[in-house]
């Protein structure tokens, strides 16, 4: 004979647990139904009546099967530096993530509590590590034979073009200028980065440090006992 199916509420067998989507009510000493996501327990069960569930009110939610007396409040609206990647519904909390060009400086369980703008590397410096959702851009000074003439959170140090005749040698923040109409070899996008000849490297001077409001994880140039944050702008 098939085992008889017990309907909630029911008293569990000694030593056994309640079934999936049920909970044990200590007061009634019965196995009772949980409420589905998007609902909460309006009336708890008794020995003779099951849990009465009700829908969550606006701006509240429950994500799991539950027997909570009140739904949870959704988080506050996303700030101007954030985008809402998940709306507040009866079944899920609002999730705010940082908008493009920003990263999460302080995360919470889901989404981000505090966004900060990605560091921009100033001319003479290129990106050494791109920003991620949770980490800032890292800048580095452009090595001999390379340059960056932009203030950017994405641009790398690019190789100088190589001239037949150099009008103005390149440096860390400026490409070489050729006298002839076209250089002998210009690094095309996606081209292999080749180390530059020594003659090109000797013309290179490091960009001079400038104080910055950027956090101390930015690139540091040695310039005394406590150098300022380097190679980036604070905005």
């Amino acid at each position: 004979l098939p085992a008889q199916v017990a309907f909630t509420p029911y008293a569990p067998e000694p030593g056994s647990t309640c079934r999936l989507r049920e909970y044990y009510d200590q007061t009634a000493q019965m196995c009772c139904s949980k409420c589905s996501p998007g609902q909460h327990a309006k009336v708890f069960c008794t020995k003779t009546s099951d849990t009465v569930c009700d829908s969550c009110e606006d701006s509240t939610y429950t994500q799991l099967w539950n027997w909570v007396p009140e739904c949870l409040s959704c988080g506050s609206r996303c700030s101007s530096d954030q985008v809402e990647t998940q709306a507040c519904t009866r079944e899920q909390n609002r999730i705010c993530t940082c908008r493009p060009g920003w990263y999460c400086a302080l995360s919470k369980q889901e989404g981000c509590r505090l966004c900060a703008p990605l560091r921009k590397c100033r001319p003479g410096f290129g990106v050494a590590r791109p920003g991620t959702e949770t980490s800032d851009v890292v800048c580095k000074p452009c090595a001999p034979g390379t340059f960056s003439n932009t203030t950017s959170s994405t641009d790398i140090c690019r190789p100088h073009q190589i001239c037949n005749v150099v009008a103005i040698p390149g440096n860390a923040s400026m490409d070489a200028v050729c006298t002839s109409t076209s250089p002998t070899r210009s690094m095309a996008p996606g081209a292999v980065h080749l180390p530059q000849p020594v003659s090109t490297r000797s013309q290179h001077t490091q960009p001079t440090p400038e104080p910055s409001t950027a956090p101390s994880t930015s690139f540091l140039l040695p310039m005394g006992p406590s150098p300022p944050a380097e190679g980036s702008t604070g905005d």
Epitope: V127, A128, R129, P130, G131, T132, E133, S135, V138, K140, P141, A143, P144, T146, T154, D155, I156, P189, G190, A191, V192, H193, P195, Q206, T217, S218, F219, L220, L221, P222
Partner: antibody, heavy 118, light 107 residues
């Protein structure tokens, strides 16, 4: 959770080819600079190749020891990076690690063994 | 190419001790230095970048310092889980280059 999983390693004869694949998940692949670092049987780490992101027009970089023989490529839609290794030499024998994020490496795969021997 | 020199090849220290590991570049690398830890049978793991910035999730007993061509990694109050090889890497210029590594053991 960030994951980089390398496949395609194995035993190959000198002069032959092999293609390594690195499948990734758990981070924004399209922004990441991806690369390969190998570790010789003597445990020395050697950077092999790197490919940067679309915003920089996907520039590629190679160690002198593999230039002209190895080619790095990526597929942002598949969140994967590849290393095509041609004209393999016995000195290419190593564990090959897939790496990501910038000119230093936040993320590493578990590595795949490449053995070049006759 | 920029050469990175780490010596000696191995180092032995007692638990609780402070250990300093050195790395020298063949030319100025302007703090473009990262440190990695590799435990036996595992992949390397980033500890430090920009010579002195601690990577997310790395215990604060690890610290990096240095400038120019001389850099060091310091481990305060050595723990048994710190038994590993430690590699430095310069990223100031391509090709990116690693030091030969230092194997740290417990006395």
């Amino acid at each position: 959770e960030v994951q980089l999983v390398e496949t395609g390693g194995g035993l190959v004869q000198p002069g032959k080819s092999l293609k390594l694949t690195c499948a990734t998940s758990g981070f924004t692949f399209s922004n990441a600079w991806m690369g390969w670092v190998r570790q010789s049987p003597e445990k020395q780490l050697e950077w092999v190749a790197q490919i940067k992101d679309k915003s920089n027009n996907y520039p590629t970089y190679y160690a002198e020891s593999v230039k002209g023989r190895f080619t790095i490529s990526r597929d942002d839609s598949e969140s994967s990076v590849y290393l095509q290794m041609n004209s393999l030499k016995e000195e290419d024998t190593a564990i090959y690690y897939c790496t990501g994020y910038g000119d230093f490496f936040d993320y590493w795969g578990q590595g795949v063994v490449v053995t070049v021997s006759s | 190419d920029i050469q990175m020199t780490q010596s000696p090849a191995s180092l032995s220290a007692s638990l609780g001790e402070t250990v300093t590991i050195e790395c020298r570049a063949s030319e100025d690398i302007y703090n473009g230095l990262a440190w990695y830890q590799q435990k036996p049978g595992n992949s390397p793991r980033l500890l430090i970048f920009n010579a002195n910035s601690l990577h997310t999730g790395v215990p604060s007993r690890f610290s990096g310092s240095g400038s120019g061509t001389q850099y060091s990694l310091k481990i305060n109050s050595l723990q048994s889980e710190d038994v590993a090889s430690y590699f430095c890497q310069q990223y100031y210029d391509h090709p990116l280059t690693f030091g030969s590594g230092i194997k740290l053991e417990i006395k």
